[in-house]
Each structure stands twice: as structure tokens, then as C-alpha cells.
């Protein structure tokens, strides 16, 4: 999906209002310095591309982020403010349904969410630089 035509201001507002709080709740008890951020993004479409991939694509080390509250809200936000996004997400929805129901938060998932926080912060910063 090409995120170029999203309403970035609206996505920022949704992130600051709800998604950020859910990400921080998921990370509760973990210091932001516990993990080294190894990926970043350079502009708004790039940031959303990487956020989408890291949130919804299961990885060998962390297969279960897609069913978390912040992921559901991220999906809703992208569907709301990115034209045509929801039509591209049928396969992703199936992947979410197949995701393990276990609520165990592994260290690797914490690390992945730490990376997500970094990508979202970069998204906000790139937004500020464009204004």
C-alpha cells in the first residue's frame, strides 16, 4: 500500500490521543533505554510503511502483536485516514485471526514495540519538520 495520500495530521492526532498510550501501557515496567532502536524512517509514507509492517507482519521472534489493542487502533486509524487502505488489508485480517491467542508478552515483543515507538516518534518529528 502507498501511504502517500494519507491524512497525516489526523493520523498524528489519533496516535497522540490513543495509540501512544496503548504502546506505553504495553511497555509498562520497561525503560525506553532497555532496547536499542535499529530501524528508523525518513518521511511520513516511509514511517507508516514500516509501522504497518512491524505491527501486522508476524516475525519468528514475536508472532502476536496484531491482536494487541494498539495494533487494532493502528489498523482502524490507517483505514480511516488512508484512502483505499482497508481494501488492501483482507489478507492481513486473516493473519490477525490466526495469530496466537496467548497473552504472554515476550522480551522480543517488548523489543519490537520499542522499535514501533521509535518509528511513531520519527513520524511525528517528520510531520513537524514539514510544517
Amino acid at each position: 500500500y502507498d501511504f502517500t495520500n494519507c491524512d497525516f495530521q489526523k493520523i498524528e492526532a489519533d496516535y497522540l490521543r490513543t495509540i501512544s498510550k496503548d504502546l506505553i501501557t504495553y511497555m509498562s515496567g520497561t525503560k525506553s533505554t532497555d532496547f536499542n532502536n535499529t530501524v528508523s524512517c525518513s518521511n511520513r509514507p516511509h514511517c507508516l510503511t514500516e509501522i504497518q509492517s512491524l505491527t501486522f507482519n508476524p516475525t519468528p521472534r514475536c508472532a502476536s502483536l496484531a491482536k494487541e489493542m494498539f495494533a487494532r487502533k493502528t489498523k482502524a486509524t490507517l483505514a480511516l485516514w488512508c484512502p483505499g487502505y482497508s481494501e488492501t488489508q483482507i489478507n492481513a485480517t486473516q493473519a490477525m485471526k490466526k495469530a496466537r491467542k496467548s497473552k504472554v508478552t515476550t522480551n522480543k515483543c517488548l523489543e519490537q514495540v520499542s522499535q514501533l515507538l521509535g518509528l511513531w516518534r520519527r513520524f511525528i518529528r517528520t510531520l513537524l519538520k514539514k510544517q
Epitope: N37, V39, T59, Q112, Q115
Partner: antibody, heavy 117, light 108 residues
């Protein structure tokens, strides 16, 4: 200390597919970063080809996108480049590199690929 | 596409002299710029990222400055091992990361 090592045929015929592999040691490619390919034609500048992130997302240079595939094998801790329908213009030193998806922090030593019949 | 233009193409200096290399972007890229050094037969090495941040392990004689469209790499006092080709790279315009054509710093 991460180390990267490119390998693959040094000679490819026109219209065939160029295939290269980058073996990574000292860091797991599924633990972090992105894993990129960059090339440099003889005596010329650098051109970014694309990357695959540690979580599997890929991004390609739009000018090469229709011909490029980057994949990975986490069990062998390596990633690969396939470039189809090559011509003499694809003759270059090909580098693999570790990236944070912005700039390129660690590089392999490079491998020269010549496209010729 | 953002085009990166480096000048001069060649810089002839003596060890101990100050080197000033320029990189210009065809449109604004904020501070999304990196500098690399490449010696003959070797891979490039990252020197500077985000226009002015020194990569770990790089000597302090290297410094970067600039924002928007105009950027500078400065080597305060050239050492013999600094004679090489230097490239700038912009990463503002994903997925079109682009490099400058290079500046060769040679011994006068």
C-alpha cells in the same frame, strides 16, 4: 562486530538473472536493522538497490523495482539479491550493507559482477 | 527525484591543510544527509549522519554542517589516510535514496 561478505558469480550473461548472497556474522539479521544492497559501476558513484528489514519488509529503488528481489534466509543468517534481465549497464561492484533504513553503517567488501556474453 | 551535487570534483591539498567539501540537494532535505569515505579498492565507510553527527569510531577532525539544501564536510587537518573519495547521501526522499557523484581529495 558485524561482518558482511558478498558471494556469487563474477560473470553473468546479458538477459540472465544476477544472483548474489550476503553472509552476515556477528549479528542476527532477524534481531534488528535492515539489510541492503548498493552497487557501484566501475569508476562511478553509488546507487542504492534496496533493503529487507529484520521484520521482513522490503523497499526497492523505483528505477530498478521491476527487476529486483531481495529475500533472506534467517536460518543461514544471510540475505540475497536477484536482478533479472541484466545488461552491460548492470556491471558493477555490488555491496551488501547493514542499514537503519536511512543510511548505511556497515559494509561488505564488495564483489565485482560483469555482464558480458 | 532529489539530485545531489558535490563540489569540487577534485580537491588538491597537502597534509595538515583544511578540507572543505560541499554537497547540494536539488530540494530541501532537512538534516537527512550522510557522508561516506571510500578508499581505492575498499567499501565506503560512514563518517557523518543526520548532517552533523559523527559516527562512532570516526576521528574528531571530521565534522559536518548544513541543513535544507546546502551541506559541508570539513576535515580540520588532513592526515595521510584521509586522501580518498567522499560521497554524500540523502535519505529524505524514501524510496529514492541518492548519492552525490563524489569528491576526490588528492595529495597536492
Amino acid at each position: 562486530q558485524v561482518q558482511l561478505q558478498e558471494s556469487g558469480p563474477g560473470l553473468v550473461k546479458p538477459s540472465e538473472t544476477l544472483s548474489l548472497t550476503c553472509a552476515v556474522s556477528g549479528y542476527s539479521i532477524s534481531s534488528g536493522y535492515g539489510w541492503s544492497w548498493i552497487r557501484q559501476p566501475p569508476g562511478k558513484g553509488l546507487e542504492w538497490i534496496g533493503y529487507i528489514s529484520y521484520y521482513g519488509s522490503t523497499s526497492y529503488n523505483p528505477s530498478l523495482k521491476s527487476r529486483v528481489t531481495i529475500s533472506r534466509d534467517t536460518s543461514k543468517n544471510q540475505f540475497s539479491l536477484k536482478l533479472s534481465s541484466v545488461t552491460a549497464a548492470d556491471t558493477a561492484v555490488y555491496y551488501c550493507a547493514r542499514t537503519n533504513l536511512l543510511y548505511f553503517e556497515s559494509w561488505g567488501q564488495g564483489t565485482l559482477v560483469t555482464v558480458s556474453s | 527525484e532529489i539530485v545531489m551535487t558535490q563540489s569540487p570534483a577534485t580537491l588538491s591539498l597537502s597534509p595538515g591543510e583544511r578540507a572543505t567539501l560541499s554537497c547540494r540537494a536539488s530540494q530541501g532535505i532537512s538534516s537527512y544527509l550522510a557522508w561516506y569515505q571510500q578508499k581505492p579498492g575498499q567499501a565506503p565507510r560512514l563518517l557523518i549522519y543526520d548532517a552533523s553527527n559523527l559516527q562512532s569510531g570516526i576521528p574528531a577532525r571530521f565534522s559536518g554542517s548544513g541543513s535544507g539544501t546546502d551541506f559541508t564536510l570539513t576535515i580540520s587537518s588532513l592526515e595521510p589516510e584521509d586522501f580518498a573519495v567522499y560521497y554524500c547521501q540523502q535519505y529524505s526522499n524514501w524510496p529514492q535514496y541518492s548519492f552525490g557523484q563524489g569528491t576526490k581529495v588528492e595529495i597536492k
